[in-house]
């Protein structure tokens, strides 16, 4: 079957890195500069991705694979294959349409990306605030006065930070 297909379609013999050139009797021609074909039997080569501006080249384009980009310092990747770069902020801030803005009172962000999240409400667990929260750090909850007994654990660390929002759809 493979041999029959090859006889019927000479293009199926063209390997990755080449294309089936209709202008030259369907012979396999190498992909031109700045283009690639990652699979065999292609009738055209795809244009290589250019990593410019905020995008840096992580992997150069070759005749058989596309370039890969990442983001310049101060930015981080979003989307499949780093299709976008998003600005970093300082800890204690979040990114908005108006740039990096400080977290509002009662919220914090301990990362350079993502959103400000509310401080843990210690009283919901019947605990008291042992260490106050800041823009950069969550509160630390301690035992309620009634819980203070010999051998009792004195500090409950806050729940681990979840990955913040701002992820692409």
């Amino acid at each position: 079957f493979e041999r029959t297909r090859s006889l019927q379609d000479p293009c199926s013999n063209c390997p990755a890195g080449t294309f089936c050139d209709n202008n030259r009797n369907q012979i396999c021609s190498p992909c031109p500069p700045n283009s690639f074909s990652s699979a065999g039997g292609q009738r055209t080569c795809d244009i290589c991705r250019q990593c410019k501006g905020v995008f840096r080249t992580r992997k150069e384009c070759s005749s058989t694979s596309n370039a890969e980009c990442d983001c310049t310092p101060g930015f981080h990747c979003l989307g499949a294959g780093c299709s976008m770069c998003e600005q970093d902020c300082k800890q204690g801030q979040e990114l908005t349409k108006k740039g990096c803005k400080d977290c509002c009172f009662g919220t914090f962000n301990d990362q350079k990306r993502g959103i400000c999240r509310p401080w843990t409400n210690c009283s919901l667990d019947g605990k008291s605030v042992l260490v106050n929260g800041t823009k950069e750090r969550d509160v630390v909850c301690g035992p309620s006065p009634a819980d203070l007994s010999p051998g009792a654990s004195s500090v409950t660390p806050p729940a681990p930070a979840r990955e913040p929002g701002h992820s692409p759809q």
């Epitope: 989307g79 976008m84 770069c85 990114l95 349409k97």
Partner: nanobody, 123 residues
């Protein structure tokens, strides 16, 4: 091909003015937020200004507020940055960029950038 091309950079004296332009092609310009960023020598890339699809929302980094004005002409597929009262610290490569699909609903990322135009402020 989706493309952004900046122009209008050059050498200008402190206190002077320049107008940068960015021509867009290969996509529906009026559907996207647009940006100016800059990179001063030896420094990280910095957001300068952004504008929404119809030009009704504009935002600036504090250091250029009141001196720079971002605008767009959707009929001409063009973005502009009018820079007045220029200072030595405005010396940088200025880049035009497009907000990614879904910008401000789910992220604040950019996906298409120009090659940049150089602005030098010096006496």
């Amino acid at each position: 091909e989706v493309q952004l091309v900046e122009s209008g950079g050059g050498l200008v004296q402190p206190g002077g003015s320049l107008r940068l332009s960015c021509g867009a092609s290969g996509f529906t310009f009026s559907s996207y937020w647009m940006f100016w960023f800059r990179q001063a020598p030896g420094k990280e890339l910095e957001w300068v200004a952004n504008v929404n699809q119809d030009g009704s929302e504009k935002y600036y980094v504090d250091s250029v507020e009141g001196r720079f004005t971002i605008s767009r002409d959707n009929a001409k597929n063009s973005l502009y940055l009018q820079m007045n009262s220029l200072r030595a610290e405005d010396t940088a490569i200025y880049y035009c960029a497009r907000g990614g699909e879904g910008y401000s609903d789910s992220h604040y990322g950019t996906d298409v950038w120009g090659q940049g135009t150089t602005v030098t402020v010096s006496s």
